[in-house]
Interface confidence: low
């Protein structure tokens, strides 16, 4: 028979518990054996104090009986031939030669029945408490202070953790939060971070991705003192931040014991999250402007966000929908993070403007507003965070209410009247055809286009082939020419202030077709972009080309 | 180049009221956060408050928070600082500091610093 | 405020490097010298590692986690002085060291 108990001395700190076991092996008899367990105390070595029993309730001497009725001092078995004595608060008299015990079930006497090892208890000097991070920040003056960080910036704590343990001991410390307000206890308490007894850096489940990104940090300064940094806070940082201490040292037999645990809550902490900031509000209000004049409209955005730099990105842009339209409209311009401006489809060639006038305040400015300009437009900022790495990360967004524009409409009417020269034209002449645009309302300054459009027929009939251009004469009096049918030269001009005229020379049959003239009144603005403010067509115009009667 | 004059320093009783004003010359004053530093004679540089390129954030020490006010026009490229409830502690050099951007409320941001202005508070 | 070291000292022609850290804010550090208490102070460096124009380039400033480095390479006598550190709190207010004095021994 062999009694085994833990290579000692062991060394616990008084106020926690300690296990200790005892298995026996090579006996004879029941496979339950019972266990009796006793205390020799420095003081009297020789006296045998009985602590607890597996067989006799009764066992337990004065000095230990309270404990043990109250559970506090217990035999626990694993099996028949192992027990473990648990004490759950150690006293410093606890402290000596503990002796497990099995008495004889053999047939003879034979091996060891009982195994001694010995505790020491020391005292209770583990010491955990809040550090200032550094320099710290505004805070209540509570404790534990009450901190707040925006979303997306530094979340720093400190933690003060030293013992004095005679021994040689190893401390482990590790920062845990609890949702604000909650009970703190194992189970609710996540752990963050932590730095192991051998000073290996471990984070929890969920923050383990930020830590291998370098967005968490623990590091130790000094002797006594550890610091966590959370980079790029989230929402989900809020809470209590506690700081954990745990005391390890190692037992004869290698294996390393925890003997002293304090925790010490450092901060309620509060994110601030942008999304709940983020505000933006537009101006002046609605505007009625006429064609040509300059569009203003200012975007603020405002709310308790932190300034745009190192952990803070800022993008703003203007949207619009058409009057009537649904949904948020195209873009029309906007400032990227990094202050850089661009135009949205369909604007590219628009004197458009787009600038941060105030810290937080942006002017959207169309030199020459149209009427397809008018609408609804919103103001459209997005709040990014930046954590520890370089990348942004999109946080918040936000909309303005919608703000409507009118842009009053030209008024401008106009009316064509084309004919063919001569009436009857043959082939191998020049037929010109004249073009009569009157003009109705607009602005001072209207300049007028003509373009001249050809249908030809197919086997007796207009083909279903769109009409093609044959040429014109732009608002700023350039010559535009297209392709001719019968492929001779063609000349188009301005034979009067509302009179457009073109020439076919050199006919053949293949001009034969129903010509018509298109003409468009334009506006120039004062960004020198030009916008049409009207257009008509002429009735059609038919040119045969006749034959001589030589030709036959 | 860039050049800040203050001005409104001397000697102030305690639990009065004093106001420095910051002249600045050499650059547009509307597109950058300007500061307050002071200095306790003997002691290091201290932190007052700062302000943004329009005003439209501002920040406080704790040493001074509810008695200070810092403000701008930058139409005269000024920056004023209003300090009531005088203390004994408020004694030193007062410097005007601008930053390099138009909204920091950073201490590492600074790229230049006025001569100073000294504030005595004394009965 | 920002932790660095009281005092540093170094023969002329050495390197000198003084540190400053615990900004809990932008983690950007500027580093501004005096030559006498009362007296303006001079940027030497600002945004951690960027040199006004008119500073010799003997002056660098880095940063390595959350600690700035002024770095001095060859110092000279006249550089004896009083050198700040400055940066921000998580709260976007302004905070400085307490100051290291350099001695040219």
């Known amino acids: 028979r062999e009694v085994l108990v833990p290579e000692g001395p062991l060394y616990r700190v008084a106020g926690t518990a300690v296990s200790i076991s005892c298995n026996v092996t090579g006996y004879e008899g029941p496979a339950q054996q019972n266990f009796e367990w006793f205390l020799y105390r420095p003081e009297a070595p020789d006296t045998a104090l009985g602590i607890v029993s597996t067989k006799d309730t009764q066992f337990s001497y004065a000095v230990f009986k309270s404990r043990v009725v109250a559970g506090e001092v217990q035999v626990q078995r694993l099996q028949g031939d192992a027990v473990v004595l648990k004490i759950a608060r150690l006293q410093a008299q606890d402290a000596g030669i503990y002796e497990c015990h099995t008495p004889s079930t053999d047939t003879r006497y034979l091996g060891s029945y009982s195994g001694k090892v010995e505790l020491r208890v020391l005292p209770d000097v583990l010491q955990v408490s809040a550090a200032p991070p550094g320099p710290r920040g505004r805070q209540a003056p509570t404790s534990p202070p009450r901190m707040t960080v925006h979303e997306g910036q530094e979340l720093a704590l400190g933690c003060l953790a030293r013992t004095s343990t005679q021994k040689h001991t190893h401390l482990a410390v590790s920062f845990g939060r609890s949702v604000p307000e909650a009970p703190v206890g194992r189970s609710t308490l996540q752990e963050v971070v932590g730095i192991r007894s051998d000073l290996a850096v471990e984070a929890g489940a969920p923050y383990a991705e930020r830590l291998a990104a370098g967005e968490l940090r623990l590091g130790k300064e000094g002797t006594d003192r550890y610091r966590m940094v959370v980079g790029g806070a989230q929402a989900g940082d809020a809470g209590t931040y506690h700081c954990t201490a745990a005391e390890w040292i190692q037992d004869p037999d290698g294996s390393w014991a925890q003997i002293a645990e304090k925790r010490a809550v450092l901060a309620h902490v509060d994110v601030q999250t942008l999304s709940s900031q983020l505000a933006v509000t537009v101006g002046p209000g609605e505007r009625r402007i006429g064609p040509g004049e300059p569009l203003e409209l200012l975007c603020n955005v405002s709310g308790a966000l932190p300034p745009a730099g190192r952990h803070a990105a800022y993008s703003v842009g203007w949207e619009m929908a058409p009057a009537g339209a649904p949904g948020p409209g195209r873009l029309v311009a906007q400032l990227d993070t990094e202050g850089v401006g661009s135009l949205g489809p369909g604007y590219e060639g628009r004197h458009i403007a787009m600038e941060k006038v105030a810290s937080r305040t942006y002017r959207l400015r169309l030199e020459a507003a149209r009427p397809g300009d008018a609408g609804t437009y919103r103001c459209l900022a997005k709040a990014y965070v930046r954590g520890s790495g370089t990348r942004l990360r999109e946080a918040a967004s936000a909309r303005s209410r919608p703000l409507p524009v009118h842009v009053r409409e030209e008024g401008v009417v106009l009316e064509a009247v084309a004919w063919l020269a001569g009436g009857t034209v043959y082939r191998g002449e020049t037929a010109s055809l004249l073009c009569n645009i009157s003009v109705r309302g607009g602005p001072p300054g209207l300049r007028l286009a003509a373009s001249w459009w050809v249908e030809r027929p197919e086997d007796g009939e207009l083909s279903s082939v769109p009409a093609q251009l044959v040429g014109g004469v732009g608002q700023d009096g350039v010559a535009e020419l297209g392709v001719r049918p019968g492929g001779g030269p063609v000349s188009v001009e301005l034979v009067g202030p509302r009179s457009h005229r073109l020439r076919l020379h050199s006919l053949g049959p293949e001009d034969e077709g129903v010509y018509h003239c298109a003409p468009s009144a334009w506006v120039q603005h004062a960004d020198y972009s030009w916008y049409q403010a009207g257009s008509a067509r002429s009735g059609p115009v038919t040119v045969y080309p006749y034959m001589h009667a030589l030709d036959t | 180049a860039v050049t800040l004059d203050e001005s409104g320093g001397g000697l102030q009783t305690p639990g009065g009221g004093l106001s420095l004003v910051c002249k600045a010359s050499?650059?547009?004053?509307?597109?950058?956060?300007m500061q307050w530093v002071r200095q306790a004679p003997g002691k290091g540089l201290e932190w007052v408050a700062g302000i943004d390129d329009d005003g439209s954030s501002r920040a406080y020490a704790p040493a001074v928070k509810g008695r200070a006010t810092i403000s701008r026009d930058n139409g005269q490229s000024t920056v004023r600082l209003q300090l009531n409830n005088l203390r004994a502690e408020d004694t030193g050099t007062y410097y005007c500091a601008k930053t390099i951007y138009a909204a920091t409320l950073n201490a590492g941001e600074i790229d230049a610093w006025g001569h100073g202005t000294e504030v005595i508070v004394s009965s | 405020a920002l932790t660095q070291p009281s005092s540093v000292s170094a023969n002329p022609g050495e390197t000198v490097k003084i540190t400053c850290s615990g900004s809990s804010g932008s983690g950007y550090y500027g580093w501004y010298q005096q030559k006498s208490p009362g007296s303006a102070p001079v940027t030497l460096i600002?945004?951690?590692?960027k040199r006004p124009s008119d500073i010799p380039s003997r002056f660098s400033g880095s940063k390595s986690g959350s600690t700035g480095t002024l770095t001095i390479t060859g110092v000279q006598a006249d550089d004896e002085a009083v050198y700040f550190c400055?940066?921000?709190?998580?709260?976007?207010?302004?905070?400085f060291g307490a100051g290291t004095t350099l001695t040219v021994l």
């Open positions: 600002y945004d951690n590692d």
């Open positions: 400055g940066s921000a709190d998580n709260n976007y207010t302004g905070i």
């Open positions: 050499g650059f547009s004053i509307s597109s950058y956060e």
